[in-house]
């Protein structure tokens, strides 16, 4: 017997869609071999209608597709706009039609139930709202209006204009009679249940002159949408439940093994701790729709998710829902990068952020996840150089190493910097990733003075001390601006053997500004790197003042002043919102740090170093 399995019988009605799932043993060969859906002819041959190699027959053009889910050992054939001609015997299979592994499927498309002439069909999802329109003639305007439900040969009164409401519809039905001149009344049923499914009869008046209109109400269970995302990547659930519940609390929940639904996040402030740091519920639009973004996808995130609306912020029968089945592909295109990066107070971190390498021109961003209420992620820095004021002088986003990875450097760390940060771009939203920064005990490896005051026209020398473990790394000084950190020209001095032997007195790289100008004022970073991979950094602020005494200044760490006060976070913070991820210009307005002027350049600035070897460190 064939190891391929699927539904033996599929039945539907004209105009509908079917989604036929076939299962196969997920061996390496099976996962990657051709999948097909073919129709068996009288001759016994099976004619391919659609395959995983992109073939679609003319009969199926524009209405069918085949999607392989190798991770799960399944493939799905979707066929829309069914006609009775589609009835027949089919095979879903692997390999070659004539001798591959296959499974027989019988598809029966019927005309659908015979409905009375002039019947209006209403197709609505469970939990939603339906408005049944009931026309009448002028002579029946003053008479009783009613809606009945046909059950077999009998008609059961549902609601009428004399204020009767059937108990099964209590608190969720209303009959509206318009003003004079409008010859139509409507019946609105909210929070539809499966049991509401059936044939209804509108009636105005009585006797032989009464007006009647049949309505066929089809209440559908929402078919879960299959969502297939990469491990470590991101998924967005877009939830549109309708205006009727625009002002009701919203939620996303995950179905557990008991078939109940555990809240993942809701608008009442509840959030599952398993999603800490990697989930946002984006504010809803006027129409009540909202979206939930989950980053850093794990295999255990797989499952069925429902979004819905209810005042309790959790699932209740008879309220609208939307459903998804999330599959997490372990054969991920998203590279592994550390999910936790550790740094010490006063030190620094260099975070590697992956992005889709096909989108090298995309704008890159880094934001700080905040868990309050529904979660938000104010942008801290972007590749165009805008940096939040409170991060002035200590945060930079670098395009290096490139080819699918950018780097974010944060220094002058404090315990307040501990938390979750998101890497994202204005391109492929599935590449959003999360990193947690932890502040641990320890001392920074690079040591520079605190505040430095330089005198106009004189020479300034700033030392940066590093430990022996960095002796073979490339050392650099750069001048920070809100568009990056411009490396300053370096000048080798002294024999390189001093570093090889790690001479105590030679473990420093110093920056010389000669002569000091007004443009030299600002933040300077001393750092180590290995090729395009950045390691630790240390920052020093140089203030420039008028000449008071002649002579050169050499600043040692002993003379360090306190670091300048941090500016507080501006209230109008940029945040990730529904649209902002697609178009960063749609973020809320904010103050940005002004560019710090010309970079110190030319021969005025030099970096004294006794090593020209290239290797790099990292604080991870």
């Amino acid at each position: 017997k064939s190891p391929v399995f699927g539904p033996q019988e599929v039945s539907s009605v004209e105009g509908n869609s079917v989604s036929i799932k076939c299962y196969y043993p997920p061996t390496s060969v099976n996962r990657h071999t051709r999948k097909y859906w073919c129709r068996k002819g009288a001759s016994g041959r099976c004619i391919t209608l659609v395959s995983s190699e992109g073939y679609v027959s003319s009969n199926y053009a524009g209405r069918a597709n085949l999607t392989n889910f190798p991770e799960n050992g399944t493939f799905v054939v979707n066929i829309a706009q069914l006609s009775r001609d589609d009835s027949g015997h089919y095979k879903c299979g692997l390999g070659i039609n004539s001798r591959g592994l296959s499974f027989d499927v019988s598809l029966e498309v019927s005309q659908g139930p015979e409905l009375p002439n002039g019947t209006e069909v209403y197709t609505v999802d469970v939990g939603r709202t339906v408005t049944i329109k009931c026309p009448f003639k002028t002579e029946n305007a003053p008479k009783t209006k009613a809606l009945y439900k046909k059950i077999g040969q009998t008609s059961v009164l549902v609601i009428d204009s004399r204020n009767y409401v059937n108990p099964n519809y209590k608190d969720r039905i209303r009959l509206r009679i318009p003003g004079t001149g409008q010859l139509i009344f409507t019946v609105v049923i909210d929070r539809l249940r499966l049991s509401d499914h059936g044939l209804y009869l509108c009636q105005a008046g009585d006797g032989s002159n009464r007006d009647e209109k049949n309505a066929d109400l089809q209440v559908l269970e929402p078919e879960p949408e299959l969502v297939y995302e990469d491990l470590r990547g991101s998924v967005t659930f877009h939830c549109a439940l309708g205006l009727e519940v625009a002002n009701v609390a919203k939620f996303l929940c995950r179905v557990n093994s008991r078939e109940t639904c555990d809240v993942v996040i809701n608008t009442l402030g509840k959030r599952d701790s398993a999603f800490e740091g990697r989930i946002l519920l984006n504010p809803q639009d006027k129409d009540g729709s909202f979206s939930v973004v989950i980053t850093g996808l794990r295999k255990e995130d797989e499952g069925r998710y429902l979004c819905g609306a209810h005042s309790d912020g959790q699932l209740q029968e008879g309220w609208p829902i939307q459903a998804w089945q999330l599959f997490v592909n372990e054969e991920s295109t998203i590279p592994r990068s550390p999910t936790v990066v550790k740094g010490v107070a006063g030190g620094s971190v260099a975070v590697l952020c992956p992005y889709n390498p096909k989108e090298s021109q995309s704008l890159k961003y880094w934001c700080l996840w905040e868990g309050a209420q529904n979660g938000r992620c104010p942008l801290l820095v972007e590749s165009q150089g805008l940096v939040q004021e409170q991060y002035e002088g200590r945060l930079s986003l670098l395009q290096e190493p490139g080819n699918g990875t950018f780097t974010v450097i944060l220094n002058q760390l404090t315990t307040q910097d501990a938390g979750f940060y998101w890497c994202l771009t204005n391109g492929d939203t599935r590449w959003r990733t999360t990193v947690e920064i932890k502040i641990i005990e320890g001392e920074p490896n690079l040591k520079v003075p605190g505040n430095v005051t330089a005198v106009l026209g004189e020479t300034l020398n700033i030392p940066c001390h590093f430990p022996c473990k960095f002796s073979s790394y490339e050392k650099y000084w750069c001048k920070w601006s809100n568009t990056g950190c411009q490396t300053l020209p370096s000048q080798d001095e002294g024999p390189s053997e001093a570093f090889v032997n790690c001479d105590e007195n030679s473990r420093l790289v110093s920056l010389t500004l000669n002569p000091v100008t007004r443009a030299d004022e600002g933040w300077y970073w001393c750092g180590v790197k290995q090729g395009h991979f950045y390691g630790e950094t240390a920052a020093v602020y140089v203030a420039v003042e008028e000449k008071k005494v002649a002579g050169s200044r050499y600043v040692s760490p002993a003379k360090a002043d306190a670091a300048p006060d941090e500016k507080v976070l501006d209230s109008g913070v940029r945040e990730i919102e529904n649209k902002a991820i697609q178009d960063p210009r749609l973020f809320a307005e904010e103050k940005v740090v002004a560019d710090t002027g010309d970079q110190a350049g030319g021969s005025r600035a030099s970096v004294d170093s006794s090593s020209s070897e290239e290797q790099g460190g990292s604080s991870k």
């Epitope: 078939e259 069925r304 699932l315 829902i321």
Partner: nanobody
Amino acid sequence: QVQLVESGGGLVQAGDSLRLSCAASGRTFPTYAMGWFRQAPGKEREFVATIRWSGSTQYKYYADFVKGRFTISRDNAKNTVYLQMDSLKPEDTAVYYCAATTLLGDPRALNEYAYWGQGTQVTVSS
């Protein structure tokens, strides 16, 4: 919580027919599939048939041993699923269990089903 109650089991002769019913009540949210499993004495519980639905579209899955002898169906209005068993054989003797799920995985897998009935005994004598 979903409650499932089976009925229709009994003692029949080989070649006879039986119709099992499974009534569902108390659903918290839509159930997409209901099925039948069976367990013969000293054997593991095994898949028999499942019906999955979406609006007016239905998907029916059967085990190999069924070979056209069994038919699964449902009555939406009554929230009930049936298993019509024809041409019964002695080897069909087992306790038959009804199960429900928001099925999206393999319909043959027991762990796909969150809710189970207490079972109804079917005995086929030769």
